[in-house]
């Protein structure tokens, strides 16, 4: 008789999850010489220990603490790029502008990017059938708690001028319910961070509106200002040209507004 298994509303653990995490760790440590010392088997053991045999609706930040310790890494605090709902462009940008970092450019972010995982209470099995959905099931699930933990700590580490890339094509350019809006904004340290600079990325080719005047951007400005952090905003009208000019800043066409 098959054992009863909890059915959750979200997709199950990404197939070959252990192999993927281990392979990503090895690849990352090969690409980043300063992380060569990392023992990827220990990293996987710590990652696994955070959620295996635990109820997937009862995960805490403390569960991830052993993994956090192993993921210790130098990140220049004044070179941090946050993003919301525009991950691909943010990553394309840091691939070109190599001295800037998104969370996914760190070991811990790289390991977990785009993956889903959960276990089951009192068994050592990984659940490949379903995992809790943040809205429909519970917020304290393994994936949500992981990203909340690392996002909070990433924001806390930031200093000087912090940049955030926002998607100008969405109805809520700044969304209070996003990880950026609910976690990162509130964990920037006013004693360390002087300015949050938003880059609003335009989607339409002929879109010349000033999206920095959008009500949700004004809401972000208000939240940030109340935290004694200065706010600035720039429209990126041509994201393709923006990336091209990051690659080739000497190009004559790069002096005009992008």
């Amino acid at each position: 008789v098959p054992r009863w298994r909890q059915q959750w509303s979200g997709p199950g653990t990404t197939k070959r999850f252990p192999e993927t995490v281990l392979a990503r760790c090895v690849k990352y440590t090969e690409i980043h010489p300063e992380m060569r010392h990392v023992d990827c088997q220990s990293v996987w053991d710590a990652f696994k220990g955070a959620f295996i045999s635990k109820h997937p609706c009862n995960i805490t930040e403390e569960d991830y603490q052993p993994l956090m310790k192993l993921g210790t890494q130098t990140v220049p605090c004044n070179k941090i790029l946050l993003w919301s709902r525009i991950k691909d462009l943010a990553h394309q940008f840091t691939q070109v502008q190599r001295d800037m970092f998104t969370l996914e450019d760190t070991l811990l972010g790289y390991l977990a990017d785009d993956l889903t995982w959960c276990g089951e209470f009192n068994t050592s099995k990984i659940n490949y059938q379903s995992c809790p959905d943040w809205r429909k099931d519970c917020s304290n699930n393994p994936v949500s708690v992981f990203w909340k933990t690392v996002s909070r700590r990433f924001a806390e580490a930031a200093c000087d001028v912090v940049h955030v890339m926002l998607n100008g094509s969405r109805s809520k350019i700044f969304d209070k319910n996003s990880t950026f809006g609910s976690v990162e904004v509130h964990n920037l340290q006013p004693e360390k961070v002087q300015t949050l600079e938003a880059w609003v990325i335009h989607g339409g080719r002929e879109d010349s509106r000033d999206l920095c005047q959008d009500p949700t951007i004004k809401e972000l400005e208000s939240i940030i200002s109340k935290r004694n952090i200065q706010f600035s905003c720039k429209n990126i009208y041509r994201p393709d040209k923006f990336l091209q000019c990051v690659k080739n800043p000497e190009d004559s066409s790069c002096t005009s507004e992008i």
């Epitope: 310790k69 890494q73 990140v75 200093c159 004693e191």
Partner: nanobody, 117 residues
Framework: EVQVLESGGGLVQPGGSLRLSCAAS????????MSWVRQAPGKGLEWVSA????????DYADSVKGRFTISRDNSNNTLYLQMNSLRAEDTAVYYC??????????RGQGTLVTVSS
Amino acid sequence: EVQVLESGGGLVQPGGSLRLSCAASGFTFSNFAMSWVRQAPGKGLEWVSAISGSGGSTDYADSVKGRFTISRDNSNNTLYLQMNSLRAEDTAVYYCADGTGPFFDYRGQGTLVTVSS
């Protein structure tokens, strides 16, 4: 701007002790958790210990648990690391940094601890 100055390192024999200090300025020291991290020659950054802003909560890497003690004096904006029963593998440059990690941008020059007979 966060500024820190580490001191107290030196050459010590295995089994010996040292007390590291970190003088902090440019921020409200008691508002921030603080950490000690270290970098051994030719190795990467390793987190050693952390302490909450009030000093009421501490945490240690397994490799130093029971040998090292982190503490702070908020009235003097100073962080300490008492290191006992030192081993050759504790040889490293020690840095203090704000926060509990895992992401650090240490601002000081660090202090070199060499454990050798």
